[in-house]
């Protein structure tokens, strides 16, 4: 099936890297600069992706691959291919709207993108706060009071705070 | 593949009550913000109501307040908009649109018509 | 009547540069980024510049934002005529705790 493919249509044999060239009786043309074909085949090359501005280049173009962007420093990628660049925060913030806030009380953030998440809640599990939360870190959790030799003592869990109500900005 | 698809668009009476759904697909949905945008025939867009992560922050367009309500089912992957006291107004193609935390509409569904008429 | 006031069209031809502008309040463009949003006929929006200035992955160059005081602008240069869509300008409003949206300028490439 192949061969018989390939005698009605010569572009079939164009490998990667070129392209089928109807103005030279379709014979197969290397990509010209700046543009590759990742498949064989192809009757056009595609433009390669310049990563300009706030996206800085991860792997070069070539013939056969498109270029790949990340982010420059201070922001990191979104959506598929990095497709978008968005600011990183501190530890203990979140973007928001309008640029990074701290976590509000009862939430942490340990890394510099994403959201501020809800610190474990202990007795869910029985056990007791061993070390407190922070707007950076969960709170460890330790043995449940009951396993505590007597004598011995945890830190008091704090009080399940309501979030007070703020603004997404 | 990164994919947003409503449902429950219809025909509906002045006075009567839908409820949207769009599913998500592609990303972490809990992760992100969520909005409900509508288009009215010929006319521009309108954001109607957005979500928080955890589902403890909404906002909606004036207009709709205390009758519509959005909602998230994070389980689900799945964005919800009940609509009640429908307006011959509230006519128009509803889609829902990831917001980074940034704030930009990166991703859209491809929109449900909503026919509000007696 | 929408919170953001853009012309309700535009219109260039192939190669020309064109701009959008797009008119605020301190409550919105004068706090807030922008974004400019392209539809085309029959499909869903997209995102063309986020941030006042930044452009997806995807956007050709050709499309510029920027921002100054309680106004900002698209701008379109090279004109082609793939670029004639609707255009939307949004930011978020502070007093309205909503976002908004300008009324739209239909782009027309003769």
């Known amino acids: 099936f192949e061969r018989t493919r390939s005698l009605q249509d010569p572009c079939s044999n164009c490998p990667a890297g070129t392209f089928c060239d109807n103005n030279r009786n379709q014979i197969c043309s290397p990509c010209p600069p700046n543009s590759f074909s990742s498949a064989g085949g192809q009757r056009t090359c595609d433009i390669c992706r310049q990563c300009k501005g706030v996206f800085r280049t991860r792997k070069e173009c070539s013939s056969t691959s498109n270029a790949e962007c990340d982010c420059t420093p201070g922001f990191h990628c979104l959506g598929a291919g990095c497709s978008m660049c968005e600011q990183d925060c501190k530890q203990g913030q979140e973007l928001t709207k309008k640029g990074c806030k701290d976590c509000c009380f009862g939430t942490f953030n340990d890394q510099k993108r994403g959201i501020c998440r809800p610190w474990t809640n202990c007795s869910l599990d029985g056990k007791s706060v061993l070390v407190n939360g922070t707007k950076e870190r969960d709170v460890v959790c330790g043995p449940s009071p009951a396993d505590l030799s007597p004598g011995a003592s945890s830190v008091t869990p704090p009080a399940p705070a309501r979030e007070p109500g703020h603004s997404p900005q | 593949e990164v994919q947003l698809l409503e449902s429950g668009g219809g025909l509906v009476q002045p006075g009567g009550s839908l409820r949207l759904s769009c599913a998500a697909s592609g990303f972490t949905f809990s992760n992100a913000w969520m909005s409900w945008v509508r288009q009215a025939p010929g006319k521009g867009l309108e954001w109607v109501a957005n979500?928080?992560?955890?589902?403890?922050?909404?906002y909606s367009v004036d207009s709709v307040k205390g009758r519509f309500t959005i909602s998230r089912d994070n389980s689900k992957n799945t964005l919800y908009l009940q609509m009640n006291s429908l307006r011959a107004e509230d006519t128009a193609v509803y889609y829902c649109?990831?917001?980074?935390?940034?704030?930009?509409?990166?991703?859209w569904g491809q929109g449900t018509l909503v026919t509000v008429s007696s | 009547q929408s919170v953001l006031t853009q012309p309700p069209s535009a219109s260039g031809t192939p190669g020309q540069r064109v701009t959008i502008s797009c008119s605020g309040s301190s409550s919105n463009i004068g706090s807030n980024y922008v974004y400019w949003y392209q539809q085309l006929p029959g499909t869903a929006p997209k995102l063309l510049i986020y941030?006042?200035?930044q452009r997806p992955s995807g956007v050709p160059d050709r499309f510029s934002g920027s921002k100054s005081g309680t106004s900002a602008s698209l701008a379109i240069s090279g004109l082609r005529s793939e670029d004639e869509a609707d255009y939307y300008c949004a930011a978020w409003d502070d007093s309205l705790s909503g976002w908004v949206f300008g009324g739209g300028t239909k782009l027309t490439v003769l």
């Open positions: 649109a990831r917001e980074t935390n940034g704030g930009a509409f990166d991703i």
């Open positions: 941030r006042n200035n």
């Open positions: 979500i928080k992560q955890d589902g403890s922050e909404k």
